[in-house]
Interface confidence: low
């Protein structure tokens, strides 16, 4: 299907294209010796990058700190400074550039004050960075503002004295609407969802804390939960982890209206040293990881029904280090459905697992073809692709980069990995599938760092190394053929790659340093490959794809969630731009229903290798710990529920008589002695 | 402040070029585009192309390919528009404008558009035997 | 190339009145639109980029709208300097286009 990959050799060379590259080549050094750069895309598709470089002398009794601020507005070819628009101020790396949501063009920096300052200080720009007002807050900010995603004039931050301030007019100026607040986030139609300490100290109160809303800014609250330890928004449901009353392990709750009603989740309550955390959420489902009791490193994934109520085992020995800590969770953006994870085997070995069809099933990566199975592998002949993702990376092993996927790259993964029996301490190399997971083929030999260009008709990399480069790679062909460009004739120490998010542009910059004897100098060159991609692609140059196809045979082939997907997809052999404005063509057709369409409801399960739900022995004739909207009720169920975001229609209706699940509710969450209505006067 | 001073006005015979120049102040010349737009009397605004006054590039409107062209001199700060083979539709206002957005005028352009900011007074060519 | 259609051409307005001009364009420009204000004998000046900010110094009577491929321009009470021909301009995609003109004129 694919051949091996290449580089420079017994592939076509693309005519001339040392000297198309050459001549959209661009070269900026920045004029100052900063020990650190920070870059941010300043809205889609405009060109604007703002370039934050800090330079910090500490001092014995304070630290002198100096920040230069670069403006590029034609993707990095020029840079032009800007510093003497914010005062030539020394803005605070730890808030980093707080880009407003969407094209809103809005930035905001926050400066570095003296110490008796009454507050601090931002710079705020409404224009793509072009021009930046001084403003001087009533307080000093403990976090970057925090746009609300519907309004970006809406800004929210928490002091450094727990107070929860609000601006309504882009930070110009602010109020403080309530005090002692822990955390703080903005949900939908500028909703503020907040928690609050009662007591003493956020830390103290853990697990007796309070959370409110309020959806007019800050005018009016209501307490919508109380002895809160945390909270999280995923997709369309609002999470709260709830100290129980008579111990001190905690229960998930959820709510899908804001919090005016809750539910108790049907997930495994935690103790004082677990965690709960959200992995992934959209507006069907939520991907949700319970740690095991004991510092294990593993816990399992459970994936919720559309209600987040009713929860399906998916994956055991879940590999997620600590709380806040390192999971390789990974949703591969390129194709629906699909995820990839690393489970901690028996041995304490670490193997890369990955789903097709939205945690349903779990299965290992199939080997490469024409590789060989490493040292870790038993049998030399059957072994797995193993990924390496965060924890590699956080264990310090020769990774630079996370697996990437693109959404408009359609079916393209790149990631590096090793194949045997389980994740190798060796140097891992770079391995492409270009069907969203279901194959994979070694793209590069070694580590490196990889990017996609035009919606994946380029594919650009660069070898990881500790010594300077001057070499960039790139594939016209998904990463089959490779040819190689010198970018400059002096070498770079290499700190990174950067293209505009989401995978449009043609342009790549190649960020680094030169270093002599004395001095430093940060650099970056820009790569436009708009003349190697020199025509538009037009419809011959596409070819259709089935999604999830295993078996072309079957008249199922390429169902996933009851649907399947016909795209368009840019032959390997052409090259050619997709463009800035390229959208994915897809053509979906429904499947018919099927039991696989189905999970099972609450109070039953089903036995391994059965597809049929049987109801839950230990829940015979006993009433259920199970609480829907806070009030005691009956629940119906067939003891089937369809698979959130499933779309098949007709074939097979589980049908079956419908039973009366009397059930108790056992939270007093929402004790209505507790929920009060404020006002903020 | 920041303005562009054109060039004095031109009368031409069919057949000629002519060769207006702009001259920027009060800003880095290499740090934004450079529209030419013309005017015929009593008619709308017609944009010519656009150039890059920091690495020379061009683009130019279908309408005038071949016919115009656009160059800069960076130590004057200074753009010139050369519209060579003039006939008498040529007759029109020109005008330079300062163009920020500039670098995706020869395909699809960014998301989000400045406009044209400054522009320069305008110089008339008038095309007559 | 886009083709910008401004609508009407003359617009006849007593001083003080709203006035609402139309641009509408053959293809989506997204929000990559400028309007211009031009008065006889000299050259024109920006009012609104990106759709619908207003440019440096302009006064607040002066509203953007719009996104995709129908625009407006509203001017809420339209004072004596405000006559003028006011132009649209789509920035999507080269050659940037102009649409026609619409001429304010006192009623």
């Known amino acids: 299907r694919r051949g091996a990959p290449a580089e420079d050799q017994d592939c076509g060379r693309l005519p001339d294209f040392i000297a198309k590259l050459t001549n959209n080549t661009h070269q900026h050094v920045f004029d100052d010796l900063s020990g650190s750069v920070s870059l941010s895309w300043v809205g889609d598709s405009t060109g604007v990058i703002l370039v934050l470089t800090t330079f910090q002398v500490p001092l014995v009794i304070v630290s002198f700190g100096q920040s230069k601020l670069y403006r590029s507005e034609d993707y990095g070819k020029n840079f032009k400074d800007i510093t003497n628009l914010i005062n030539n101020t020394f803005i605070r790396t730890e808030f980093g550039m707080a880009i407003g949501p969407e094209n809103s063009g809005k930035v905001i920096l926050t400066a570095e004050v003296s110490g008796g300052s009454r507050g601090g200080r931002v710079f705020r720009s409404s224009d793509f960075a072009k021009n930046f007002v001084q403003t001087d807050l009533p307080f000093h900010p403990l976090t970057q503002m925090m746009y609300s995603p519907q309004n970006s004039d809406y800004l929210l931050a928490l002091s450094t004295e727990n107070g929860l301030w609000v601006s309504k007019n882009f930070g110009e100026k602010w109020e403080e609407i309530h005090k002692a607040v822990c955390l703080a986030k903005w949900g939908p139609n500028n909703i503020i969802f907040f928690t609050t300490h009662v007591n003493g100290s956020c830390k103290a109160d853990l697990g007796a804390l309070e959370l409110w809303r309020t959806s007019d800014l800050g005018k009016t609250f209501k307490t919508i939960g109380v002895k809160i330890y945390s909270f999280g928004l995923g997709g369309r449901f609002l999470f709260a982890s709830v100290m129980a009353d008579k111990d001190t392990t905690r229960r998930i709750h959820v709510s899908t209206d804001q919090g005016d009603t809750w539910s108790m989740a049907q997930l495994p309550s935690v103790g004082q040293e677990q965690f709960y955390s959200i992995l992934a959420a959209n507006e069907d489902m939520v991907f949700m990881h319970v740690d095991e009791p004991g510092d294990t490193g593993f816990g399992t994934i459970f994936t919720s029904d559309d209600r987040g109520i009713v929860y399906s085992k998916s994956l055991d020995r879940h590999l997620y280090t600590t709380t806040g800590g390192e999971t390789d969770f990974t949703n591969v953006t390129s194709l629906r459905g699909v995820y990839i994870t690393s489970t901690l085997s028996e041995d304490n070995s670490i193997q890369s697992m990955i789903t097709f069809d939205q945690g349903g099933r779990w299965e290992h990566l199939r080997k490469p073809e024409n590789s060989k199975c490493d040292a870790t592998a038993k049998n030399k002949n059957e072994c797995s692709l193993h990924i390496h993702a965060s924890y590699s990376i956080s264990q310090k092993l020769n990774v630079p980069m996370a697996p990437l996927s693109e959404p408009n790259a359609v079916g393209i993964v790149i990631a590096h990995g090793s194949v045997g029996d389980a994740i190798s301490v060796m140097v891992p190399d770079v391995y492409i599938s270009d069907d969203g997971g279901y194959s994979w083929a070694k793209m590069l030999e070694g580590p490196h760092y990889y990017t996609i260009l035009d919606s994946g008709g380029i594919i650009v990399a660069i070898e990881h190394s500790n010594r300077p480069i001057n070499v960039i790679k790139f594939s016209t062909d998904e990463g089959q053929c490779w040819q190689s460009y010198v970018f400059t004739q002096e070498p770079i120490y290499f700190t990174g790659l950067a293209s505009e998010p989401g995978a449009r542009s043609m342009n790549i910059s190649i960020w680094g340093f030169t270093e002599s004897f004395i001095t430093r100098q940060w650099v970056s060159y820009t790569v436009d490959f708009k003349d190697i991609l020199e025509r538009n692609c037009e419809e011959d140059d596409y070819t259709t794809w089935l999604a999830h196809s295993t078996d072309p045979g079957d008249y199922k082939d390429g169902c996933i969630l009851g649907y399947k997907e016909q795209f368009l997809r840019l032959r390997k052999s052409s090259v050619c731009q997709n463009g800035r404005d390229y959208v994915v063509a897809k053509q979906p057709s429904v499947c018919p229903c099927s039991l696989e369409d189905f999970l099972c409801d609450f109070g039953y399960f089903r036995p391994e290798n059965a597809s049929e739900c049987v109801e839950q022995p230990e829940l015979k004739g006993h009433e259920l710990e199970f609480c829907l909207y806070g009030k005691e009720e009956h629940l119906t169920t067939n003891g089937y529920r369809k698979i959130p975001g499933d779309k098949c229609q007709g074939g097979m209706n589980p049908a079956r008589e419908v039973k009366d699940l009397k059930k108790k509710c056992t939270s007093n969450f929402l004790n209505p002695t507790k929920q009060n209505s404020k006002s903020n006067s | 402040q920041v303005q562009l001073v054109q060039s004095g006005a031109e009368v031409k015979k069919p057949g000629a070029s002519v060769k207006v120049s702009c001259k920027a102040s009060g800003y880095t010349f290499t740090s934004y585009y450079m529209s030419w737009v013309r005017q015929a009397p009593g008619q709308g605004l017609e944009w010519m192309g656009i150039?890059?006054?920091?690495?020379?590039?061009?683009s130019y409107a279908q309408k005038f390919q071949g016919r115009v062209t656009m160059t800069r001199d960076t130590s004057t700060s200074t753009v010139y528009m050369e519209l060579s083979s003039l006939r008498s539709e040529d007759t029109a206002v020109y005008y330079c404008?300062?163009?920020?957005?500039?670098?995706?005028?020869?395909?699809?352009?960014?998301?989000?558009?400045?406009?044209?900011?400054?522009w320069g007074q305008g110089t008339t060519v008038t095309v007559s035997s | 190339e886009i083709v910008m259609t401004q609508s009407p051409a003359t617009l006849s307005v007593s001083p003080g009145e709203r006035a609402t001009l139309s641009c509408r364009a053959s293809q989506s420009v997204s929000s990559n639109l400028a309007w211009y204000q031009q008065k006889p004998g000299q050259a024109p000046r920006l009012l609104i980029y990106?759709?619908?900010t207003r440019a440096t110094g302009i006064p607040a009577r002066f509203s953007g709208s719009g996104s995709g491929t129908e625009f407006t321009l509203t001017i809420s009470s339209l004072q004596s300097e405000d006559f003028a021909v006011y132009y649209c301009q789509q920035a999507r995609l080269g050659p940037w286009t102009f649409g026609g003109g619409t001429k304010v004129e006192i009623k």
């Open positions: 990106g759709a619908s």
């Open positions: 404008a300062r163009d920020p957005s500039g670098i995706a005028a020869a395909g699809p352009a960014s998301r989000y558009y400045y406009g044209m900011d400054v």
């Open positions: 150039i890059n006054p920091s690495g020379g590039s061009t």
